[in-house]
Amino acid sequence: LQDLCSNCPAGTFCDNNRSQICSPCPPNSFSSAGGQRTCDICRQCKGVFKTRKECSSTSNAECDCISGYHCLGAECSMCEQDCKQGQELTKKGCKDCCFGTFNDQKRGICRPWTNCSLDGKSVLVNGTKERDVVCGPSPADLSPGASSATPPAPAREPGHSPQ
C-alpha cells in the first residue's frame, strides 16, 4: 500500500478515502513533493504582505512586503517598517543615527563609521549619518601639510533600495 502512495506526484495527495488513489490538491493547497498524504494550505499574503508569486498545486505562494516595509526572516515571514537613510528603527520608531554612525539603507541599524586607521589608511571623505567614510591613502602617502579629509558630497538621497 505504501508503494501506491509513493507514486503520487507533487501536486497530488494520496487519498486514503479512495483506496489510496492520487487526488489533485484542492484549490488553495499544494504539495511540493510526491507521496504526500495531505496537501498543505497555501500561504496568503495579506495586510502588510503582498503576493510575489501565486500559489500553485506544486508550490506555496511567496510574499513580499508592501511599499514602506521590508522583509525579515526566512521566506519573508515578517514585514518591518522602513526608515530613512541616516536612521534606524527602534522600539519608539525611526531615530536618527548618533554622531559617528551611519545607515545608508532604509533598513538595518546605524553602524560605526569605518576606522580607516585599522587598515593604516587615512579618512579621504568624512562620514555622515547616511554615508560611511571613504578611506584613502595611508598618512605616510600624503604630502606634508595636505588635508587628509575632504568634506562629504552634498547631501542627497542616494536611494539605496531596501532588500
Epitope: 541599524i109 571623505v125 571613504v134
Partner: antibody, heavy 119, light 107 residues
C-alpha cells in the same frame, strides 16, 4: 598580507546545490564587508550580495535572492556562499571580495571559484 | 538598479598610446565610481576608487575623472602589461553594479 583564498572548482548536476568558501587572513575579519561577485563565461561582473561578518547582516541583489545564501563563520574567518537549484546559467566564476575600508569599493579579491553546472 | 554604460566594449592601441574609457551611470552616483583591471588569468585588481583616487602601488599612468553621470578612465601611455579587461563599478546604491567591461588589446 591581506588575503582571500577561495575553495576549488566544482562540477554539479542541475538541481543540486554548491557551497563556495572564502577564507580571510591578514586582517580583522569582522570589521569589513565581504562581497560575492559572479562572472559568467565571456560576460561582465555581477554583484550578488554581501555580509558584515560581525553580526552576519546581509544584503542581496534581488536577482540572486532566491539563488544565493551568504553566511560567515567568525571562528574560522571564513565566508560562504551557497547556490541552490543549480541550472546551466549558474555556470560561472564566483569571486569573494573585501571592501576598501568602507563598502563602496573592493580592494581585495579572491582568486575565483569556477562552478560548472552540467548534466 | 543603476545601469552602467561602459564604452568602448573593446579597443586596440599601440604601446605609448593614450587610452580613454568612459562610463555613464543611468543616474547620479556622486563620486562613488571605481575602476578595476582583470588580467587574462582572471585576477582582478582595484586601480582607482572614488572617481579619481589612485590605489597605493598603482602606476601613475592610470587616472580617473568625472562626477555624477559621466566618468572617464585614462591610461596616459599604454604599456604591454596593461593588456586586460577594465570594468567600472558604482558603489552609490544597492545593488552595486558594474559596467560590461572594455577589453584592451595591443596593436
Amino acid at each position: 598580507q591581506v588575503q582571500l583564498v577561495q575553495s576549488g572548482a566544482e562540477v554539479k548536476k542541475p538541481g543540486a546545490s554548491v557551497k563556495v568558501s572564502c577564507k580571510a587572513s591578514g586582517y580583522t575579519f569582522t570589521s569589513y564587508w565581504i562581497n560575492w561577485v559572479k562572472q559568467a563565461p565571456g560576460q561582465g561582473l555581477e554583484w550578488i550580495g554581501n555580509i558584515y561578518p560581525s553580526d552576519s547582516y546581509t544584503n542581496y541583489n534581488q536577482k540572486f535572492k532566491d539563488k544565493a545564501t551568504i553566511t560567515a563563520d567568525k571562528s574560522t574567518s571564513t565566508a560562504y556562499m551557497e547556490l541552490s537549484s543549480l541550472r546551466s546559467e549558474d555556470t560561472a566564476v564566483y569571486y569573494c571580495t573585501r571592501d576598501y575600508g568602507s563598502s563602496y569599493s573592493y580592494n581585495v579579491w579572491g582568486q575565483g571559484t569556477t562552478v560548472t553546472v552540467s548534466s | 538598479d543603476i545601469q552602467m554604460t561602459q564604452s568602448p566594449s573593446s579597443l586596440s592601441a599601440s604601446v605609448g598610446d593614450r587610452v580613454t574609457i568612459t562610463c555613464r551611470p543611468s543616474q547620479d552616483i556622486s563620486n562613488y565610481l571605481n575602476w578595476y583591471q582583470q588580467k587574462p588569468d582572471k585576477t582582478v585588481k582595484l586601480l582607482i576608487y572614488y572617481t579619481s583616487r589612485l590605489r597605493s602601488g598603482v602606476p601613475s599612468r592610470f587616472s580617473g575623472s568625472g562626477s555624477g553621470t559621466d566618468f572617464t578612465f585614462t591610461i596616459s601611455s599604454l604599456q604591454p602589461e596593461d593588456i586586460a579587461t577594465y570594468f567600472c563599478q558604482q558603489g552609490d546604491t544597492l545593488p552595486y553594479t558594474f559596467g560590461q567591461g572594455t577589453k584592451l588589446e595591443i596593436k
